[in-house]
Interface confidence: medium
């Protein structure tokens, strides 16, 4: 599923991401935009043999199990394919673990490079939340 901007903002808010670990909803929507272009089925392969999955591009070396990533830790204890569902629950729950891990949203390269320090509130402007 490819979410609309405000549709995703509303879904993320429903799942408790607004101000989770101090990150406003705009940060999460911005991250999703630049990680996956709001596409729940996005997959991207990395040079280390791991793959990033879903709307927040969660990595198989650390967070989920795709059955083929050497030394996978599967810290979210889920199959990576669950992160590709049109229901973002699994992605959000795993993202909450990731953001609680110590580096905050710096874990997402796209957030670091494209969202951090910008007017992230623009990503939820005009949305009925």
């Amino acid at each position: 599923k490819v979410f609309g901007r405000c549709e995703l903002a509303a879904a993320m808010k429903r799942h408790g991401l607004d101000n989770y670990r101090g990150y406003s909803l705009g940060n999460w929507v911005c991250a999703a935009k630049f990680e996956s272009n709001f596409n729940t089925q996005a997959t991207n392969r990395n040079t280390d043999g791991s793959t990033d999955y879903g709307i927040l591009q969660i990595n198989s070396r650390w967070w989920c199990n795709d059955g083929r990533t050497p030394g996978s830790r599967n810290l979210c204890n889920i199959p990576c394919s669950a992160l590709l569902s049109s229901d973002i629950t699994a992605s959000v729950n795993c993202a909450k673990k990731i953001v609680s891990d110590g580096n905050g949203m710096n874990a997402w390269v796209a957030w670091r490079n494209r969202c951090k320090g910008t007017d992230v509130q623009a990503w939820i402007r005009g949305c009925r939340l």
Partner: antibody, heavy 116, light 107 residues
Framework: QVQLQESGAEVMKPGASVKISCKAT????????IEWVKQRPGHGLEWIGE????????YYNEKFKGKATFTADTSSNTAYMQLSSLTSEDSAVYYC?????????WGQGTTLTVSS | DIELTQSPATLSVTPGDSVSLSCRAS??????LHWYQQKPHESPRLLIK???QRMSGIPSRFSGSGSGTDFTLSINSVETEDFGMYFC?????????FGGGTKLEIK
């Protein structure tokens, strides 16, 4: 136990298309990548690409882009590979395998012969 | 693409001999190297994953070693059932690639 069952041998004419199937049993089909591998005598094993059935995400070896197309039907736990514009170079045994990085589980292979 | 070069192309041995098969990668692939045996008209069979981890049910006479670019599959005291083709495969990057194979034949 995990099993991959491929469709039977095919004899096709040049220019035609063929669709090979791979039915998976014994595991959660949607959560593992299915890989496709080509084997020709004297050419060894070549990786064609892969599909993640749960999402339909696909990756292709550049060499096979435009030649192979992957699909999957999670209701029947079956992956498919269509090969188009067949030539004699496509005559080979085609295997599906479960993509664990390594390949512990293979189909029995589908022999494709392209001949006029 | 990562190229895998296997040597020798053919190895003629007598049952009871011990042999080593080589697989060399064109760039470092850490330990992401796997070994297969294939007999005529059969699918490949995984022997060793991640350079040295023998799969369940594979006889202990098979062992793997190496890291980086140079890998070895050793068979201690070859048995008649071991004859066939042996392939290496890397999972360090895409596209996945295989070696050209080593044919183990009876002398």
């Amino acid at each position: 136990q995990v099993q991959l069952q491929e469709s039977g041998a095919e004899v096709m004419k040049p220019g035609a298309s063929v669709k090979i199937s791979c039915k998976a049993t014994g595991y959660t089909f949607s959560t593992y990548w299915i890989e496709w591998v080509k084997q020709r005598p004297g050419h060894g094993l070549e990786w064609i690409g892969e599909i993640l059935p749960g999402s339909g995400s696909t990756y292709y070896n550049e060499k096979f882009k435009g030649k192979a197309t992957f699909t999957a039907d999670t209701s029947s736990n079956t992956a498919y590979m269509q090969l188009s514009s067949l030539t004699s170079e496509d005559s080979a045994v085609y295997y599906c395998a479960r993509g664990d990085g390594w390949y512990c589980y293979w189909g029995q292979g589908t022999t494709l012969t392209v001949s006029s | 693409d990562i190229e895998l070069t296997q040597s020798p192309a053919t190895l003629s041995v007598t049952p009871g001999d011990s042999v080593s098969l080589s697989c060399r990668a064109s760039q470092s692939i850490s330990n992401n190297l796997h070994w297969y045996q294939q007999k005529p008209h059969e699918s490949p069979r995984l022997l060793i994953k991640y350079a040295s981890q023998r799969m369940s049910g594979i006889p202990s006479r098979f062992s793997g070693s190496g890291s980086g670019t140079d890998f070895t599959l050793s068979i201690n005291s070859v048995e008649t059932e071991d004859f066939g083709m042996y392939f290496c495969q890397q999972s360090n990057s895409w596209p996945r690639t295989f070696g050209g194979g080593t044919k183990l034949e009876i002398k």
